[in-house]
């Protein structure tokens, strides 16, 4: 039998301790929120908020401008000054809770924890390829805001998620805020609301539609809004909340809330429980049927998928899929599974399940005892009755009221538990060629870029590297600009190429040339690198013979 070279073990063909230096920016304080802007004339910016300050950066992470957003009551607060001479309420630090782009004219909108959670609109001022912020406009009309009815009170100090949708020329802000009794009593933010920005940017139109946790549940029933996004005809919010109103706080679970993006109303507000599980290939004795539940969503991102993953998920290439990183939760007992799992929920399937749930509630024969749910938002009732009514009313439609769909949507970990002890804290999914890549930040300050594939029993890494020496968790917000992603960790913002930071972590030629084409790796004498790093021969097709 002919002698063969011994095979290099897979793990020995790469080194994840290789240091990669990626561009970074020190913000001078813990990064709170971050958003990117790409104009149509090649101008772009990264907006980074820390306590009392908003930084404007170029795409290279060089500082372009800095704006004081607090403390409220301080003469140096530049945004506060836009509201005219005060006083405007209690003084104090401003933590930026919302940073979104208003696309039409275009402008940046920032909303903070101070000044009743009001927002400021900053017109974008392109100067060459850089972007500056014009003087802020105060989105607050004193005459139509009262403590019990405040259309211009947007941000909650406990957290707020906003998605901006253009309907015609109007900009509608879909707002979801975490509340407690104290916050609810102070200028009455709502749990979920849809607010129209007035054309003259003098604030938000009064008479907006909203849902709020009922006063009697505010103490025990808290909803954390993890993510929001707009795709197709809907806006979606992802929440972590108590599974039961009566047992709250109790065990937590994850829900998806769906709102119409074409009609600014909440009659067709729907919720669906998302169930993510780890189902090992070989089930241990005593392990739960259907897999180990991971009920608590940590981070989420929606993206169109590449051909390979689409085939595995039985959907068409390019279809939008919601990806979520889930953890087991505090009360799950001693875990034998991984710390984090990743589940994929195709949006079309989510919509179908919601629509079927509406049919079950509203089309006869209705299953007796089927509850409308959402008892923390509305009076309890059974389908098909409207909330608070014991019988259907002839002039109200069952469909025109909020509903919790009676079934949940269950998926299993895409990574088959292979994330192991890794604690994922940030997620952004991209499609590169026909491949779908999950870009993940971790609790110990690393970036993992991994191909998403269901059928493998190992992880297909694009990269796995440390952002620096601080080891601080990577934060939830991730933004994209061109071919780069921007991650925040501690007081730093990092620019990470979508195709990975480099190829040096591949140690063997064979492993190097098997890297995905989009990475641009080739063998370069005795190392794996990109063509521009290789002064001599660079080979993407053949390895030199092993001696």
């Amino acid at each position: 039998k002919e002698w063969q070279c011994p095979r290099t073990p897979y793990a020995a063909s790469r080194d994840f301790n290789v240091k990669y230096m990626v561009p970074s920016f020190s913000a001078g304080g813990l990064v709170q929120t971050m958003v990117t802007y790409q104009g149509d004339k090649n101008e772009s910016a990264v907006f980074v908020a820390i306590r009392n300050r908003l930084h404007v950066l170029g795409p290279d992470l060089k500082s372009v401008q800095s704006l004081a957003t607090g403390p409220a009551g301080d003469p140096g607060c530049q945004t506060c000054a836009a509201c005219g001479p005060g006083p405007h309420g209690p003084s104090g630090d401003t933590d930026t809770k919302v940073l979104v782009l208003e696309p039409a004219l275009p402008a940046l909108v920032s909303c903070g924890s101070s000044l009743q959670g009001r927002c400021f609109l900053h017109d974008l001022d392109p100067q060459g390829t850089a972007v500056h912020l014009a003087a802020p406009a105060c989105l607050f009309s004193a005459h139509h805001n009262r403590p019990d009815d405040c259309p211009d009170c947007v941000a909650s100090p406990l957290g707020t998620r906003v998605t901006v949708v253009e309907q015609g020329q109007a900009s509608y802000f879909y707002v979801a805020s975490s509340l407690d009794a104290a916050v609810a009593a102070s200028f009455s933010p709502r749990s979920v609301s849809i607010r129209r920005l007035k054309a003259d940017a003098s604030g938000f139109a009064p008479g907006f539609v909203a849902l709020s946790v009922l006063p009697k549940h505010l103490v025990s029933y808290s909803i954390e809004y993890v993510h929001s996004f707009h795709t197709g005809a809907f806006v979606y919010f992802l929440t972590v909340q108590p599974a039961s109103v009566t047992d709250a706080p109790g065990a937590l679970h994850t829900r998806l809330a769906r709102l119409s993006a074409t009609e600014p109303e909440l009659g067709d507000y729907r919720e669906l429980v998302l169930d993510c599980r780890f189902a090992p290939k070989r089930r241990r004795r005593g392990a739960p049927e259907g897999g180990q539940p991971y009920p608590v969503l940590r981070v989420a991102h929606s993206a169109p998928v590449g051909a390979q993953l689409a085939t595995e998920l039985s959907i068409a290439e390019g279809q939008e899929v919601l990806f979520g990183v889930f953890v087991a939760g505090k009360d799950s007992g001693p875990g034998v599974g991984p710390n984090s799992v990743v589940c994929a929920f195709p949006i079309d399937l989510l919509d179908t399940l919601i629509d079927e749930g509406v049919e079950r509630c509203c089309e006869s024969p209705v299953h007796p005892g089927l509850r409308r749910g959402l008892d923390f938002f509305q009076s309890p009732s059974f389908c098909p009755n409207p909330p608070g009514l014991e019988a259907p009313s002839p002039n109200t439609s069952c469909r025109h009221f909020p509903l919790l769909v009676s079934s949940s949507f269950s998926r299993v970990d895409l990574f088959n538990g292979l994330l192991g002890t890794v604690e994922v804290t940030a997620l952004y999914v991209t499609r590169l060629d026909n491949v779908t890549v999950a870009h993940m930040g971790t609790a110990d300050g690393r970036i993992l870029q991994v191909e998403l594939a269901r059928s493998l029993n190992y992880l297909l890494y694009v990269s796995n590297f440390s952002l620096g020496d601080s080891g601080q968790p990577v934060q939830r917000d991730v933004s994209r600009l061109g071919d780069h992603l921007f991650f925040a960790s501690g007081d730093q913002v990092f620019q990470v190429p979508i195709q990975g930071p480099g190829c040096r972590h591949f140690l063997t030629c064979g492993r190097c040339l098997r890297a995905q084409r989009f990475m641009g790796c080739g063998w370069c004498g005795n190392m794996c690198g990109r063509q521009k790093e290789c002064p001599g021969s660079w080979q993407q097709d053949h390895c030199p013979p092993k001696l």
């Epitope: 104009g39 004339k41 039409a104 004219l105 275009p106 609109l121 017109d123 974008l124 001022d125 392109p126 014009a134 003087a135 406009a137 105060c138 989105l139 607050f140 009309s141 005459h143 139509h144 015609g168 020329q169 109007a170 129209r196 007035k198 054309a199 003259d200 940017a201 003098s202 604030g203 139109a205 009064p206 008479g207």
Partner: antibody, heavy 120, light 107 residues
Framework: EVQLQQSGPELVKPGASMKISCRAA????????MNWVKQSHGKSLEWIGL????????SHNQKFKGKATLTVDKSSSTAYMELLSLTSEDSAVYYC?????????????WGQGISVTVSS | DILLTQSPAILSVSPGERVSFSCRAS??????IHWYQQRTNGSPRLLIK???ESISGIPSRFSGSGSGTDFTLSINSVESEDIADYYC?????????FGAGTKLELK
Amino acid sequence: EVQLQQSGPELVKPGASMKISCRAAGFSFTGYTMNWVKQSHGKSLEWIGLINLNNGGTSHNQKFKGKATLTVDKSSSTAYMELLSLTSEDSAVYYCARWLRRGGYAMDYWGQGISVTVSS
Amino acid sequence: DILLTQSPAILSVSPGERVSFSCRASQNIGTSIHWYQQRTNGSPRLLIKYASESISGIPSRFSGSGSGTDFTLSINSVESEDIADYYCQQSDSWPLTFGAGTKLELK
């Protein structure tokens, strides 16, 4: 002194297109948006759309989408409106008017207007 | 679109009289209403912004009031130079809209 100087009157043939200008002086041009307003003979005012003089962002009245294209040249502090495929319905006086898009401001300065006549 | 209805279409006054123009919005627009004067062959001129805020250089005889859907422009002692068309305009919602106008003429 704030001034909005519009180009002179125009006689154009049906089917043609034309570009009218509004040159600004006496204020920080890029801090504002420029509105365009139509007034047909003996009629009221109709808002066509506006352009952010800073970043070129626009908002149109749907009625004029495809009829009016708004542009800006920051170097000459001039806003432009191109009117496309003109018909007799487009015969009117067209005004530019500056506006700071934020609470507390309205269209405080107007150009002198340009009379457009569409006739063969 | 928000419809602004101005009434009356024509107002006939004598110099020195007090006169009021009405503007009604088809929905609540807070105080996002502005008033303009347009003399014959002239450009519109801003008189009042945000329902009641005065404009520098505009005579103090012009005043405005109202909020929600009903708004009023008043001239407390009409002078001959006030003969013109008067328009209200809303900035609450896109598209921005104007009323049909009220013509002020001398008796």
